[in-house]
Interface confidence: medium
């Protein structure tokens, strides 16, 4: 499919001008290659009319130009003094005319309306309001006022001052007679429809002395604004419908076959399933404007979108609307990353988030999409060392591996962690990607004790059992804090006996804390990694208490204080069940608060939007650089 994009249809009137914008992927080659505008012949072929290399056909001499905007990835063709002869099929493109790097454009030039003398022209957008002013003389001040519409050869009464309203205009038209000082009446038509366009006649009086005024009403269908975005990127539709519809329900819909427009999202709470987890409708401003953000763009998202206002929250005749034609460029600069990441309850996930590598210094964020109230995304963690309180000890954002990718690790997974998450930066806002975390059945691979208590001044040894499947991975222990997870020395104690059917390649790696101090209290992670790519992690909370009896503590899986949410296995090892381990020092009320996520709408329909990849999670060795 050609990555070139432009307007499918351009309509104008004889004598007027048009400006046609064509988009291309702004690669170095594309920016500098030839741009052209050609007319398609009946037998194929395309005859160049103007190009960026200076060529201008005699047909366009003195009335057309082509300007390239390499920094935007666009070029613009301006054509003036249009005639009906200019109607036809054209291409805008790059390189050689026949190469296929082009987009088809249909140009329709119509004759201007043949208007009667003294005709006032009203040009109004679809769905808006028009006021037709009708002057009259004093002798007709007390006589009937009326507005007719010319249908074919006959004038049809639309409204009059005796109270008649044509059924086609019911509920959206009124006739106002100005105060005695002004010899003027006006007809106001709301929620204009395309069918309202045409010639009108207003009249004061019914005899040969009546005053008449001709009006020509042109109702404009909004020209779609062209929007060119990368596959996997995001788009924002800014919809400004005006203050008169500030209190009317708003919607964004996508045109399907014919005149159908399927609601994508509206302010009445409707949201299309295909956009679950990747759409936000921003609150409307006092002037009735609002915006819709869609992330994780797919090929099938391309098409014509309309935003509008109607009490039903969907497109109806007479809705004021704005239109966009979205083109999704498949030659995307945004790298592929898994759209679904699966994690086992009690274990972890490591999510890779792409960002624009030119913006390595930008702040990175991760947020949880919530479906409530038209979608929102509370931030959970950022690269400046902030972590939402409920996620302390189990969430970390790493700048690694860098060069266009950062990593987010979430461990101690529970079923409540299932949902959609957004990767964000404060740089190029088009780089917003979405990942769905699914919680699946299974056992965590890494085995660690539950919460551990260390004694001040003594030595603590905490084991982490790695199955043989991780034999080729680097194994580590680290201490979690808001800015990451700082690497700690650890000892390989040889093969682990924690796994059935696992050979000598399994490993027991211990963390040793010598001469424990209060500062040693906190969360510790053990994990695996390969280079800068992180695998599974497991978390242990170490509490510190006063000395009771001398000696050092060597915590085995079986020995650690059994908590209500843990069970001792026959093999003598204890396994942590599917619960997030909270700081044991929290009071019961605080624990409840820390364990309750901001209430989302509860409905989290899973949408597999692409590649699915099972992943583990982990932590980091390096501090953030602020």
């Amino acid at each position: 499919k050609s990555p070139i994009f432009g307007p499918e249809e351009v309509n104008s009137v004889e004598g007027n001008s048009v400006s046609i914008t064509c988009y291309y992927p702004p690669t170095s080659v594309n920016r500098h290659t030839r741009k052209y505008w050609c007319r398609q012949g009946a037998r194929g072929g395309c005859i160049t009319l103007i190009s960026s290399e200076g060529y201008v056909s005699s047909k366009y001499a003195g009335r057309a130009n082509l300007t390239n905007f390499p920094e935007n990835g666009t070029f613009v063709v301006n054509i003036a003094q249009l005639s009906q002869d200019d109607s036809g099929r054209y291409k805008c493109g790059l390189g050689i005319n026949s190469r296929g790097l082009s987009f088809d454009v249909s140009l329709e030039v119509s004759q201007g309306p043949g208007l009667l003398n003294d005709t006032k022209v009203y040009t109004v957008d679809l769905g808006r309001t028009v006021t037709i002013n009708c002057p009259f003389k004093t002798e007709n001040a007390q006589k009937r006022k009326s507005l007719y519409k010319q249908i074919g050869l006959y004038p049809v009464l639309v409204i009059d001052s005796s109270g008649y309203v044509n059924p086609n205009y019911t509920g959206r038209i009124r006739l106002d007679i100005q105060g005695t000082g002004q010899l003027l009446f006006s007809v106001v038509i709301n929620q204009l429809r395309l069918s309202d366009a045409g010639q009108y006649l207003c009249q004061a009086g019914d005899d040969s002395n009546s005053n008449k005024k001709n009006a020509d009403l042109q109702v404009l269908k909004p020209e779609p604004e062209l929007v060119y975005e990368d596959l996997r990127g995001s788009v924002t539709f800014h919809c400004a419908l005006g203050p008169e519809v500030a209190n009317v329900a708003k919607f964004l819909c996508r045109q399907s076959s014919g005149e159908n427009c399927d609601v994508v999202v509206n302010t009445l709470g409707k949201r299309a399933p295909a956009f679950e987890g990747r759409i936000l409708l921003n609150p409307q401003d006092k002037d009735g404007s609002f915006s819709v953000v869609i992330t994780g763009l797919r090929k099938e998202d391309a098409g014509r979108y309309l935003c509008g206002a109607h009490s039903d929250g969907q497109l109806q005749e007479g809705s004021p609307i704005q239109a966009w034609q979205l083109f999704v460029n498949e030659e995307s600069t945004i790298p592929r990353s898994p759209t679904v990441v699966k994690g086992v309850a009690g274990s972890s996930v490591a999510v890779l988030c792409p960002y624009n590598r030119k913006e390595s210094k930008s702040i990175k964020y991760w947020c949880l999409w919530e479906g409530a109230q038209n979608g929102r995304c509370p931030l959970l963690v950022d690269s400046e060392g902030w972590v939402k309180a409920q996620y302390e000890g189990r969430l970390s954002l790493l700048e690694e591996p860098g060069n266009g990718t950062f990593t987010v690790i979430l461990n101690q997974l529970t079923s409540r962690d299932a949902g959609f998450y957004w990767c964000l930066t404060n740089g190029d806002t088009l780089w917003r990607t979405t990942v769905e975390i699914k919680i699946i059945e299974g056992e965590p691979n890494l085995k660690v004790p539950g919460n551990v208590t260390a004694v001040l001044g003594e030595t603590l040894k905490v084991p982490c059992h790695f199955p043989c499947k991780f034999s080729s991975y680097e194994k580590y222990w680290c201490k979690w804090n808001n800015t990451g997870c700082q690497a700690l020395p650890s000892q390989d104690e040889g093969p682990s006996k924690a796994f059935v059917n696992c050979d000598e390649n399994s490993r027991l790696v211990s963390l040793t804390l010598n001469l424990v101090t209060r500062a040693d209290e906190g969360w510790y992670w053990c994990g695996v990694k390969q280079g800068h790519f992180y695998g599974e992690t497991a978390a242990v909370y170490v509490a510190v208490e006063e000395r009771k009896a001398a000696g050092s503590r060597d915590v085995s899986l079986a020995k650690a204080d059994a908590a209500p949410d843990e069970k001792v296995l026959d093999s003598g090892f204890r396994e942590i069940e599917n619960k997030a381990i909270q700081d044991p020092r929290l009071f019961a009320e605080e624990k409840a608060v820390a364990d309750t996520r901001d209430q989302a709408d509860g409905s989290r329909a899973s949408v597999d939007s692409g590649s699915s990849e099972e992943q583990g999670g982990s932590s980091r060795h390096h501090h953030h650089h602020h």
Partner: nanobody
Framework: EVQLVESGGGLVQAGGSLRLSCAAS????????MGWFRQAPGKEREFVAR????????DYADSVKGRFTTSRDNAKNTVYLQMNGLKPEDTAVYYC?????????????????WGQGTLVTVSS
Amino acid sequence: EVQLVESGGGLVQAGGSLRLSCAASGRTINTYVMGWFRQAPGKEREFVARIDWSGSSTDYADSVKGRFTTSRDNAKNTVYLQMNGLKPEDTAVYYCAGSAYYSGYVTHRDFGSWGQGTLVTVSS
């Protein structure tokens, strides 16, 4: 956590104007939804205005619509409340608040960071 400090309050005559500023420190607020609230003596704290992360979407209490305007300068990590046509009933302590929500609707309970407030007194 972000720290917010309001300034610009004071005594003004009815019909006058004031511009309140809210300077944030501790972290960048360019993905925060920011809000203004006020509390008159003996009354509950009430919502005044909010502005989304980009500054493109604002929202106001009915009592201040058309008179108050909120804006933000993300480069300066600062949010503003321009108050025109002040009335005696606007007298209150004005608070700036931040919510770590990326876009979308934000309810009052979502504002987690608060300033100490600045007093605005409107005399008749």
